[in-house]
């Protein structure tokens, strides 16, 4: 007989204490964890369950994006009676269980954070053996990854009528402000498209018409720092070509 229960409540505070003798399933996760790109972060997750002294096989799972159906980023399994949860999956080798599932702790450490890790994560525990039961966090914990700006692309492109335009794309969190400077420009915020659709941390700024030869510099800045990159425009006057 395989039985499973979902409790409709999910506690968002790690401090909540359950003292009732007949525990119900619940999970305690914070709403959000913040960390900087390149650093490590800990995603806390503790749970209570109704199966007193459960000692059978268990699996701990973390998934990203959406509960129940999102892709797994971490999975480990502990054999009956064992406190060792043997890792079966760790995406890119960057996820490691900090907690002890036998002690109702599924907390996860994520190493070498990147902006792409900025998503919601959901913990899940599964029992099998004499007791079959599972429970998953419905709301999850949002991992908010911050990063100083980085210019990922800067280029000069041809426009109609032998003109040229410049594009600068930068990433960062908070999304950086972009500014162009160059010949006869001073400082220009220049048609910022921010952020790009489907690329939450990318910001693009365009200089629609480059009227003078010379060096054009794009500066990206947010609360964590600044970055700049330059392109050079040199046109062969009297001809239709250009050198950048």
């Amino acid at each position: 007989f395989v039985r499973t229960k979902i409790d409709t409540t999910e506690n968002l505070l790690n401090t909540e204490v359950h003292s009732s003798p007949a525990q119900r399933w619940s999970m305690q996760v914070p709403p959000e964890v913040s960390a900087e790109a390149g650093d490590a972060a800990v995603l806390p997750c503790t749970f209570t369950h109704p199966h007193r002294h459960y000692d059978g096989p268990l699996t701990a799972i973390w998934r990203a994006g959406e509960p129940y159906a999102g892709p797994q980023v971490f999975r480990c399994a502990a054999a009956r009676g064992s406190e060792l949860c043997q890792t079966a999956l760790s995406l890119h080798g960057r996820f490691r269980l900090l907690g002890n599932p036998r002690r109702n702790d599924l907390s996860l450490r994520v190493e070498r954070l990147a902006l792409a890790d900025d998503r919601r994560y959901f913990c899940r525990v599964e029992f099998a053996g004499d007791v079959h039961d599972r429970y998953e966090s419905r709301h999850g914990v949002r991992l908010h990854v911050t990063a100083a700006p980085r210019i990922v692309n800067i280029s000069v492109l041809p426009s109609p009528a032998h003109a040229f335009r410049a594009l600068c794309t930068a990433e960062g969190e908070p999304p950086p402000a972009l500014a162009w400077s160059g010949p006869a420009l001073g400082n220009s915020l220049a048609a910022v498209r921010s952020p790009r659709e489907g690329h939450g941390h990318l910001v693009t700024a365009e200089l629609p018409a480059l009227t003078h030869d010379g060096r054009y510099t794009c500066t990206a800045a947010n609360s964590l720092g600044r970055s700049e990159a330059s392109v050079y425009l040199f046109r062969f006057h009297g001809a239709s070509g250009a050198s950048t």
């Epitope: 499973t4 699996t59 509960p67 599964e126 099998a128 599972r134």
Partner: antibody, heavy 122, light 107 residues
Framework: EVQLLESGGGLVQPGGSLRLSCAAS????????MSWVRQAPGKGLEWVST????????YYADSVKGRFTISRDNSKNTLYLQMNSLRAEDTAVYYC???????????????WGQGTMVTVSS | DIQMTQSPSSVSASVGDRVTITCRAS??????LAWYQQKPGKAPKLLIY???FEHRGVPSRFSGSGSGTDFTLTISSLQPEDFATYYC?????????FGQGTKLEIK
């Protein structure tokens, strides 16, 4: 492309045997529980069997227990259903189905094969 | 075993109508319920899982609700492609069981 492709169905006499296969592609096969679900002509869906991602545990409907065996070869990304002592009431389209997000549990079946017809008749 | 009972067994409706299908479990299954759509000669397709979560790619006109023993699938505004048979299924305990199906026909 994420898909499941069943094969091995056909006509078999009562008491005979058949082995169904389900080839999976496009996902990490060993990470998910897999199941067989059948549908008799003009009837509804009936769960037949489930196997955990690593093959550690298998579960069966009472109607097939002792006659059918579910197995998987994770190195070949293939699920099997060995059907012995077949009866007329086993006549159905057999679907293999993937669990939505777990290697031990089938919270729901999010991916289905196209089905393979098994006819048991003399 | 847990029995799943769907109602109605069949329903006639027109494009644009709002349609509700109910599913009742013979015991408390918490939220472990899924809904599927099946068209003739085709495999079932997952619509809703864990009672209320829309499967990715499923149009937002499909929604699920309920917990315990009573569940509902609602199609807010019927489209021509929605005419099919719908099944509920519990995954609370093995043996997993399906409802008998609800055939949605064009009026």
């Amino acid at each position: 492309e994420v898909q499941l492709l069943e094969s091995g169905g056909g006509l078999v006499q009562p008491g005979g045997s058949l082995r169904l296969s389900c080839a999976a592609s496009g996902f990490t096969f060993s990470s998910y529980a897999m199941s067989w679900v059948r549908q008799a002509p003009g009837k509804g869906l009936e769960w037949v069997s489930t196997i955990t991602g690593g093959g550690e545990s298998t579960y069966y409907a009472d109607s097939v227990k002792g006659r059918f065996t579910i197995s998987r070869d994770n190195s070949k990304n293939t699920l099997y259903l060995q059907m012995n002592s077949l009866r007329a009431e086993d006549t159905a389209v057999y679907y293999c189905a993937k669990a939505i997000g777990s290697s031990w549990y089938s919270d729901a079946f999010d991916l289905w094969g196209q089905g393979t017809m098994v006819t048991v008749s003399s | 075993d847990i029995q799943m009972t769907q109602s109605p067994s069949s329903v006639s409706a027109s494009v644009g109508d709002r349609v509700t299908i109910t599913c009742r479990a013979s015991q408390d299954i918490s939220s472990w319920l899924a809904w599927y759509q099946q068209k003739p000669g085709k495999a079932p397709k997952l619509l809703i899982y864990v009672a209320s979560f829309e499967h990715r790619g499923v149009p937002s006109r499909f929604s699920g609700s309920g917990s315990g023993t009573d569940f509902t699938l609602t199609i807010s505004s019927l489209q021509p492609e929605d005419f099919a048979t719908y099944y509920c299924q519990q995954s609370y305990s093995i043996p997993y069981t399906f409802g008998q199906g609800t055939k949605l026909e064009i009026k």
